[in-house]
Structures are given as C-alpha cells and as structure tokens.
Interface confidence: low
C-alpha cells in the first residue's frame, strides 16, 4: 500500500497548491488555458497532464512573484506512478488538450481542483474494493 499512500499524499498536496494559487489569481497572467471538465472515466490522467502542461504564469507584479512561481513549479512535478496511471486504458482515445474549453486562471484552477478531487475519490473507491496498487 506504500505506493498508494504516497500517491494520495501527493494528490492532496496538489489540491493545497491549487488552493494557494487561487489566493493569487489576480497576480497571474490573464491568459485563457485549456481546462478539462466532466472528464471521461479513464481519461483522468490525460486531463491531468493537460492541466500540468498549461502555461500558467505569474504576471510579475509585486511581492508574490516568487511564491507563485514556486507553486506553479510544484504543480508540474510528476506524481508517483500507479497501476491505473501507468496503464491508462488503451482502448480509449482521450480528447487532446486543445479540444478542451479554454478558461481564465480562476476557472482553470477550480477545474483542476475538481479533477484532483475526482481522482482522489476514485482512488479511494478502488482501494476499498481491494485493488493492489503500487
């Protein structure tokens, strides 16, 4: 279960980072970014990578620039691998990042948080069903 627990901790940390960035939303470049929503079952990892690839940037205004850049860097760190993530079901072709609706930073972060919460829920649900993840 160690790998699973490490994965869960990381996902929860990501939610904290997203929440932190939401506090500085006025200091982010007001660019529209692909923001997956209502992600299809088994396309969660694909959508997750779209959020990570998005060019979220600090507007370089004021004292918050450093903390924003550190948080964005943390968001882009690769999470611990899991069976589910490694074997995204190859029978599905997931939507490309560009096909998702583009949203400003505030909505982008809200949707990212929503996806992370869904992934945590499904991960826990799989655990209670006795999945052997590592």
């Amino acid at each position: 279960m160690q790998g699973q627990d490490r994965h869960m901790i990381r996902m929860r940390q990501l939610i904290d980072i997203v929440d932190q960035l939401k506090n500085y939303v006025n200091d982010l470049v007001p660019e529209f970014l692909p923001a997956p929503e209502d992600v299809e079952t088994n396309c969660e990892w694909s959508a997750f990578s779209c959020f990570q690839k998005a060019q979220l940037k600090s507007a370089n205004t004021g004292n918050n620039e450093r903390i924003i850049n550190v948080s964005i860097k943390k968001l882009k760190r690769k999470p611990p691998s899991t069976n589910a993530g490694r074997r995204q079901k190859h029978r599905l072709t997931c939507p490309s990042c560009d096909s998702y609706e583009k949203k400003p930073p505030k909505e982008f972060l809200e949707r990212f948080k929503s996806l992370l919460q869904k992934m945590i829920h499904q991960h826990l649900s799989s655990r209670t069903h006795g999945s052997e993840d590592s």
């Epitope: 079952t41 079901k89 599905l92 991960h123």
Partner: antibody, heavy 120, light 107 residues
Framework: EVQLVESGGGLVKPGGSLRLSCAAS????????MNWVRQAPGKGLEWVSS????????HYADSVRGRFTISRDNAKNSLYLQMNSLRAEDTAVYYC?????????????WGQGTTVTVSS | AIQLTQSPSSLSASVGDRVTITCRAS??????LAWYQQKPGKAPKILIH???SLESGVPSRFSGSGSGTDFTLTISSLQPEDFATYYC?????????FGQGTKLEIK
C-alpha cells in the same frame, strides 16, 4: 449500499420495442462507465453495450448495433437501453453493470437482472 | 473481436480439491481480464480484477494469474459454496468478450 435495479423487461413480439431502465444508488453514478450484459436461457454471458461517464464513448456488440441504443441521465442516476426491431435471439436476462473506474479492469457491481422475452 | 477460450467447459471435483480453470485469449490482452462466479438464478459476482487482484470480500482461496494470452483462476481448497459456473472477461478492446464458461460440479 451500492445498488443497481433494472426494470422494463417483459414479453414483446418480434419487431417490437422495449426500453430497459437501471436505477443506481449508493455511489457517484456520474463517475463510472456503465454496461448492459445479457444472458440467454441456459447460455453464457454476452456483453451488449457500454457508455462512459459523460456519454462521450459508446460501444455496442455487433449483434445489436443499429437496433439498440444505450443512454444515461447522470442527474437521475439512471442508465437506459432502448431496444428496437427485437428478435427471438434477443430473449435473455439483461443485467445493468458498473465498470470499475480509473484504469481498473472488471465489472464490480451487477443488478439482479430483468427478463426480456421476444416471442409471437 | 478477441476470443476467449475457457477450459475445461465442465469439471467435477470434491470439497477440498485444488481446482484450476484456464482462459486463453486469441491475442495479447495484457492484464485486462476479470473472473466472475455465477450461481443458478443469480447475477454474476466479480472474483478477480486486473487478472490477479482479489476483489474485496472474496475468500483468499481464490487467486488469479497470467498476463498476455494465458490466464488461470485457481481455487486452492474447494468449499461447498464454490460449485458454480465461472467466466473470464477481457477489457483490452471493444467488443468486450466473455469466455464460454466453466461449470464446476460436485463429484
């Protein structure tokens, strides 16, 4: 308690139509792919159709393609199977089945089944 | 479509026996396979997912193994309640397909 309850089965004449429903409870329905699986009397299991969480991907067995339509209403926690141009060989118990999410392979929750009989 | 061939089709065994059922896929399906148990008049029940992961609540006498094209379901010590029909199912590609079933009967 996680539960799937099918309804809508019955006796229908060849060429007729029937709509099966499946009411889901005890889990977040909108997060899971759902399937219909059938079993003819004394025979094995046959997968019929699949629909992903947001209805983005829909698949059918060759034996029912063009005649059956799967759909879902996440707001009502319901899955449906519209069956048209029914044939004698469609006679079976139809099960509503939840597919595991997030990259796991298996169908972990099954309804009790509803019986469809196609006969003149 | 990927074909799954189960063997044997039927099997007679006694309580306490070790029983192995095999499922062979017509092409490589990685570990995208599940095993189910079905009793007369009842819905199937999942035993094993991802080829070898035991479903929660399923007794540890059941185990699954294999990857690629050859898979096995093993019951280490048969209990009276294990007499039923067993099916394998592949999830590698659509259409999903089931094996034809293996009926396990009391000797």
């Amino acid at each position: 308690e996680v539960q799937l309850v099918e309804s809508g089965g019955g006796l229908v004449k060849p060429g007729g139509s029937l709509r099966l429903s499946c009411a889901a409870s005890g889990f977040i329905f909108s997060s899971y792919s759902m399937n219909w699986v059938r079993q003819a009397p004394g025979k094995g299991l046959e997968w019929v159709s699949s629909i992903t969480s947001g209805s983005y991907y829909i698949h059918y067995a060759d034996s029912v393609r063009g005649r059956f339509t799967i759909s879902r209403d996440n707001a009502k926690n319901s899955l449906y199977l519209q069956m048209n141009s029914l044939r004698a060989e469609d006679t079976a118990v139809y099960y509503c089945v939840r597919e595991r999410g997030w990259g796991y392979y298996g169908m972990d929750v099954w309804g009790q089944g509803t019986t469809v009989t196609v006969s003149s | 479509a990927i074909q799954l061939t189960q063997s044997p089709s039927s099997l007679s065994a006694s309580v306490g026996d070790r029983v192995t059922i095999t499922c062979r896929a017509s092409q490589d399906i990685d570990s995208a396979l599940a095993w189910y148990q079905q009793k007369p008049g009842k819905a199937p029940k999942i035993l094993i997912h991802d080829a070898s992961s035991l479903e929660s609540g399923v007794p540890s006498r059941f185990s699954g193994s294999g990857s690629g094209t050859d898979f096995t379901l093993t019951i280490s010590s048969l209990q009276p309640e294990d007499f039923a029909t067993y099916y394998c199912q592949q999830f590698n590609s659509y259409p999903y397909t089931f094996g034809q079933g293996t009926k396990l009967e009391i000797k």
